[in-house]
């Protein structure tokens, strides 16, 4: 069976194909590689001559025992290897060599005892190791380590690392890797020599299920003493052995340890009063909790130094009361409990997540809400009723606003978004809005990408809504039971390039609404009922136009729209998709693709 | 259609085909068994997967006596720090594990309960495996 | 500049309803922020009563839950108190304010004294 | 309901003394409180919110320090105009509360 061409010439999928031996009838530029889950079971030397070019190489359980010097020797532009799964027992000193641009290198799972006797420290180019899932017991990192001055990733997660010494990491003292994330989840830690990452510099430290009991997590956060990481992961896996206890102590010793992010990522154990908890963790730039459960979050200090609050996939008992002066970012998206918004007090925001929460909000959108007048990122999607009370005073240096999936309530009965001219997005999709005031986008004169897919109009008649929005791109009306619309509604947006009217009820096409649009590149009206066209004479199209979707509609294929089916082959040239485009009627024509029609058609006297 | 036996319990039986063509190997093993009426046990699934499984989801299609419910998505591994170690798991990795789970109070009527579980993972987006569960209920009289 | 100016009767007599206006300039109520009743009892301490929020939505003191009403007038930018049944611990000066995101009171009304008394 | 007690409730003080109020929650506020001063006949005066942060146009004499359950108003020169009553109000929950009050009296 032969490998399948995914881009010709350049990438091959071979995966699972019971090959025993590399393939030789593929061409040499082939770039990228796919041998997974083949018997390979032996990799001689010069493997890969017929592949010279190669840069992505994935070798993922192919029952690899033995690799020989020079296995790789031809792949000089080699960038990623990937020997996952792989029960090897014997691999060459040479084993990696002629690997000059090799940047990642994966051996997770594949027998792997020692980082020792490991044959990479010619490897200058390696950005990424991954040899988790192993059989490590040293966290000693060898010598040629030094050689290694372009590594940004090593995980060792999975592996049977029980201490760290101080002489583990002396090769990181005599050259300090800057940017080096290092990944110790899942080893059974029970001891980490105080001292041993002191003057260490890290860019990511994780240690998730390491401990498996509160003293010993105590220690070895201890152990860590005088290390500085930009960004500590701390926390458990939900699949795997957790902590029984968890208290204030657990995270005492990270007063000693000079952190710019922290994140505590899942913990099974119920959290009533965090504020002792996180006490080392005032002057963090940057802070995350991820699945945890929290009984209330009311005592964060406003003075706390945090520029970026993560709470993500978290259980509260109420909405958190968050006052925190130098907070320029909140992330709260998917938490469960709180379903009440409650006024925030973050003077400094400027970007501001809370989707997902199934939220409702009594009134919305007043600075007097988030306590900020800077904020310029707002997205309040997937919650639940919105009661939009406000025109969002105080809050005119907003450019980003997303309601979409939420129940927006009061929509219709002022100009809700009258002080926002700085805004560029705005999604509005399935809010369960239904359209009746004219003036329901006034003032938004810089806006450029506006959806609203999925919502209604009164009377299913689309009005002169747009008047104001002169620098509109994007307009997205689909899923809005449209029947009509006012032949001037788009008269104003001279710079849309994308108009999406599909999954409307429109039984008629006409041109001219679409006169003034000089920059239209886009035009969806798929799975609408066109049958016809509004007028005998259909004009063209701006000249800009460059797609014209009309597939999924109801074409009707007879005599007396023959102007219509031939104005549309006509267009033939912007249509998109056309096999999908087929007559709906007469019966005996339903299913034929309209463009392959030739009607001809007689008057009959 | 090779079906493949889960378990039984006092007021259920749990088998499952696959509803893909590739018909990966998974091991699923639950104790103790499911009871639909309240239950609390383990789940152990051994897995060697043909994806990375980054990004993991699945998509639930489930069916109440012939009664089509709407379609389910449920994130398992968001992409980064996620809740469940196998979400760091690559292919060609093993994936060996278990996950408790518990549930109580919710009555079930008697009958057939399909579900057809679509795994996907990865960027870009792919199936990993498809999975037919099939549920027969029977009540306790007690 | 925001501005609070509280109006009303000066004398309620015991079991009547006792009613109050705050009338506001320079800032809309309906723009933003909660309007809230505070009184203070002659020589006494302060005592929160309740608020109106902009969007409409209204709490209360317990303490005076079952006797407490605020409402507003968005026409003319005014919210206003009743308070009913009242008794002799009732008369104190009657202040509107509102209140910051902080939950503290940086604008508050003059004050009006209403004394209950036949 | 969170309890807030002020001490002492009258103090009678020199002109360029120092001056200590003090305010005790009922239970961890973090800090969440404020501090304002009023005088006879007029409204209360927003001074310090959030424990230590002092509002735009309030003398640089006036500070404040605490976080949890106990905290400190501190008048460091205090000056005749300085006579007032002043309070305490915590922002922590609901229903909002205020302390008792202390008195300033220059001697």
């Known amino acids: 069976e032969p490998c399948v061409e995914v881009v010709p010439n350049i990438t091959y999928q071979c995966m699972e194909l019971n090959f025993y031996k590399i393939p030789d009838n593929l061409p040499f530029s082939t770039k990228n590689l796919d041998l997974s889950f083949n018997p390979l079971r032996h990799l001689g030397s010069y493997s890969f001559f017929s592949f010279p070019e190669l840069q992505v190489l994935d070798l993922s359980r192919c029952e690899i025992q033995t690799i020989e010097d020079g296995a790789y020797q031809s792949l000089s532009h080699l960038s990623t290897l990937i020997l996952t799964g792989n029960p090897i027992q014997s691999l060459a000193l040479g084993a990696f060599s002629g690997l000059s641009s090799l940047q990642k290198l994966v051996a997770v799972e594949t027998n792997l005892a020692s980082l020792e006797n490991f044959p990479i420290g010619h490897l200058k180019t390696l950005k990424e190791l991954n040899v988790a899932h192993n059989l490590i017991q040293s966290f000693k990192l060898p010598e040629y380590f030094s050689n290694l001055t372009n590594l940004e990733h090593l995980d060792l997660s999975s592996n049977k690392i029980q201490s760290i010494y101080c002489t583990d990491l002396r090769v990181l003292h005599q050259m300090p890797l800057l940017n080096l994330s290092l990944d110790l989840s899942l080893n059974p830690m029970n001891f980490i020599q105080p001292g041993a990452f002191k003057e260490i510099r890290l860019h990511k430290l994780t240690l998730r299920n390491n401990f498996d009991s509160l003293n010993v997590m105590k220690t070895c956060i201890q152990g860590l003493a005088g290390l500085e990481v930009h960004r500590l992961v701390l926390g458990e896996f939900r699949n795997e052995g957790n902590l029984e206890k968890f208290d204030k102590s657990a995270l005492e010793g990270l007063c000693n340890l000079t952190i710019e992010e922290f994140r505590l990522a899942y913990l099974d154990y119920y959290l009533d009063d965090i504020i002792d908890l996180f006490n080392c963790l005032t002057n963090v730039s940057s802070f995350s909790l991820v699945s945890v459960t929290i009984e209330r979050v009311k005592d964060f200090s406003y003075n706390f130094g945090w520029q970026h609050l993560e709470l993500v996939n978290c259980k509260f008992g109420q909405f958190p009361t968050l006052k925190l002066k130098s907070l320029k970012r909140l992330t709260f998206t998917s938490n469960k409990g709180g379903n009440a918004f409650s006024e925030v007090d973050l003077p400094s925001l400027e970007f501001l997540d809370l989707s997902r929460n199934g939220l409702s909000f009594k009134g919305c959108c007043s600075q007097s809400d988030f306590g900020t007048t800077s904020l310029k990122y707002l997205d309040l999607s997937f919650n639940g009723v919105i009661t939009m009370s406000s025109n969002f005073l105080g809050l005119e240096q907003l450019e980003h606003l997303d309601f979409q999936h939420s129940n927006l309530k009061q929509m219709s009965e002022f100009s809700v978004f009258l002080s926002l001219r700085n805004l560029i997005y705005l999604d509005i999709s399935h809010t369960h809005t239904r359209v009746a005031f004219n003036g329901i986008f006034n003032g938004l004169s810089s806006l450029e990408v506006l959806k609203m897919a999925g919502n209604s109009f009164q009377e299913n008649f689309l009005p002169d809504i747009f008047t104001e929005l002169r620098n509109l791109t994007f307009l997205d009306l689909s899923q809005c039971q449209l029947e009509q619309l006012s032949p001037t509604a788009f008269n104003s947006l001279s710079s849309l390039q994308v108009l999406n009217m599909s999954h409307n009820n429109f039984f008629s096409l006409d041109t001219f609404p679409y006169k003034c649009l000089n920059s239209l590149q886009v035009l969806d009206y798929s799975l609408n009922h066109i049958m016809t066209s509004k007028k005998q004479e259909l004009q063209h199209f701006p000249s800009s136009l460059a797609f014209l979707n009309l597939t999924q509609n109801d074409f009707a294929c007879t005599c007396e729209h023959q102007s219509f089916l031939q104005w549309i082959k006509d267009q033939r040239q912007l249509l998109v998709e056309v096999e999908r485009m087929e007559c709906a009627t007469p019966s005996d024509k339903q299913g034929m693709p309209v463009l392959s029609l030739n009607i001809t058609c007689q008057m009959n006297k | 259609q090779k079906q493949y036996w889960v378990c039984n319990s006092s007021d259920a039986s749990i088998s499952y085909t696959y509803c893909d063509k590739m018909q990966y190997p998974i091991s699923i093993n639950v104790n103790p068994c499911i009871e639909l009426k309240r239950s609390k046990g383990l789940l152990h699934i051994f897995y060697i997967p043909r994806r990375d499984l980054k990004q993991l989801y699945f998509n639930l299609y489930i069916t109440v006596n012939t009664m089509n419910l709407p379609k389910r998505k449920e994130v398992i591994c968001r992409g980064s720090d996620d809740d469940y170690s196998f979400c760091r798991a690559l292919k060609g990795e093993t994936v060996n594990t278990t996950i408790s789970f518990s549930f109580k109070g919710i009555k079930f009527s008697k009958g057939k309960y399909k579900c057809v579980v679509e795994a996907i993972s990865g960027s870009p987006e792919e199936m990993l495996f498809c999975l037919e569960f099939v549920i027969l209920h029977q009540p306790n009289s007690n | 500049q925001v501005q609070l100016q509280e109006s009303g009767p000066g004398l309620v007599k015991p079991s009547d309803t006792l009613s109050l206006t705050c009338a506001v300039s320079?800032?809309?109520?309906?723009?933003?922020?909660?309007w809230h009743w505070i009184r203070q009892p002659p020589g006494k301490g302060l005592e929160w009563m309740g608020y109106?929020?902009?969007?409409?939505?209204?709490d209360f003191n317990p303490s005076l839950k079952t006797r407490i009403t605020i409402s507003r007038d968005t026409s003319k930018n005014q919210f206003s108190l009743k308070l009913s049944s009242v008794t002799a611990v009732d008369t104190a000066v009657y202040y509107c304010?509102?209140?910051?995101?902080?939950?503290?009171?940086?604008?508050w009304g003059q004050g009006t004294l209403v004394t209950v008394s036949s | 309901e969170i309890v807030l007690t002020q001490s002492p409730d009258f103090q009678s003080v020199t002109p360029k003394e120092k001056v200590t109020i003090t305010c005790r929650a009922s239970?961890?506020?973090?800090?969440?409180l404020h501090w304002y001063q009023q005088k006879p006949d007029q409204s209360p005066k927003l001074l310090i919110k959030?424990?230590?942060h002092a509002i735009s146009g309030v003398p640089s004499r006036f500070s404040g320090s605490g976080s949890g359950t106990d905290f400190t108003l501190t008048i460091n020169s205090l000056e005749a105009e300085d006579a007032a009553t002043y309070y305490c109000?915590?922002?922590?929950?609901?229903?909002?509360?205020f302390g008792g009050g202390t008195k300033v009296e220059i001697k």
């Open positions: 239970q961890s506020i973090s800090d969440h």
């Open positions: 109000q915590q922002g922590h929950s609901f229903p909002l509360t």
């Open positions: 959030y424990a230590s």
């Open positions: 320079g800032y809309s109520i309906t723009g933003g922020y909660s």
């Open positions: 304010a509102r209140k910051d995101p902080s939950d503290a009171f940086p604008y």
């Open positions: 109106i929020h902009y969007s409409g939505y209204t």
